[in-house]
């Protein structure tokens, strides 16, 4: 899994390309996404 | 491979009800979220509804908010959209559709026609 | 809120190259979109993703004619030698999540004509 912390150092990731992915990731782990 | 096969489509009057059934295959159903995607006659695509691999989070536009309903039988690997309050502007092809890791979505099923008129 | 603007239609001849735009709202101008693409009669099909900086990938079965690229706020679907298997509507999409809500919007389409 990927952290948080890291995927926000993503360079050249639109913060809505990582709202994007973490929903992904939400919708197939039912993580809460608060 | 994938398959997903809807049915349950037909005409209904307004103000009626209808229930739409997605049969999936070909994969582990209860992996992945699924999607609802409707196209009017003619018109362009219309996302109508997503839920949650195991069905604990639902979302809808606010065009069908309180009238629709998504919900899954992971046990059945069967997709559902229950549609109350049908309008004409709900008559439209309706597609399920299953996400990836990557894309919202990845694979459409054939659709089935929703018809509401009078 | 956000929109996409596409062309409602392109012709181009066969074994030409194609380029086709799908433009975000300017407020909306880092996003990453989806490409569909949907043959008459047919349901959609997944083409790709796209993100910002033109990176993207394809889905099953997409030929490697079919590429991405971006500009600003635009977003480019490449298709190299047109085939007519290629004539079909050119749909893309942005979804969104705001306050634990999902909204996911598709643009009107372009209708690729392929003559010759």
């Known amino acids: 899994a990927v952290s948080e912390h890291q995927l926000l150092h993503d360079k050249g990731k639109s913060i809505q390309d990582l709202r994007r992915r973490f929903f992904l990731h939400h919708l197939i782990a039912e993580i809460h996404t608060a | 491979q994938v398959q997903l096969v809807e049915s349950g489509g037909g005409v209904v009057q307004p103000g009626r009800s209808l229930r739409l059934s997605c049969a999936a295959s070909?994969?582990?159903?209860?992996?992945?979220?699924m999607s609802w995607v409707r196209q009017a006659p003619g018109k362009g695509l219309e996302w109508v509804a997503t839920?949650?691999?195991?069905?604990?989070?639902?979302y809808y536009p606010d065009s069908v908010k309180g009238r629709f309903t998504i919900s899954r039988d992971n046990s059945k690997n069967t997709l559902y959209l229950q549609m109350n309050s049908l309008r004409a502007e709900d008559t439209a092809v309706y597609y399920c559709?299953?996400?990836?890791?990557?894309?919202?979505?990845?694979?459409w099923g054939q659709g089935t026609l929703v018809t509401v008129s009078s | 809120q956000l929109v996409l603007t596409q062309s409602s239609s392109a012709s181009f001849s066969l074994g030409a190259s194609a380029k086709l735009t799908c433009t975000l709202s300017?407020?909306?101008?880092?996003?990453?979109i989806e490409w569909y693409q949907q043959q008459p009669l047919k349901p959609p099909k997944y083409v790709m993703d796209?993100?910002?900086?033109?990176?993207?990938s394809t889905g099953d079965g997409i030929p490697d004619r079919f590429s991405g690229s971006s500009s600003g706020a635009d977003r480019y679907l490449s298709i190299s030698n047109i085939q007519p298997e290629d004539e079909a509507m050119y749909i893309c999409?942005?979804?969104?999540?705001?306050?634990?809500?999902?909204?996911?919007?598709f643009g009107g389409g372009t209708k690729v004509t392929v003559l010759g």
């Open positions: 796209l993100k910002q900086d033109g990176s993207h």
């Open positions: 839920i949650s691999s195991g069905g604990s989070y639902t």
């Open positions: 559709a299953r996400q990836t890791t990557m894309t919202y979505f990845a694979y």
């Open positions: 300017s407020q909306h101008s880092t996003y990453t």
């Open positions: 070909g994969f582990t159903f209860s992996s992945y979220g």
């Open positions: 999409g942005v979804g969104d999540t705001i306050k634990e809500q999902f909204v996911y919007v």
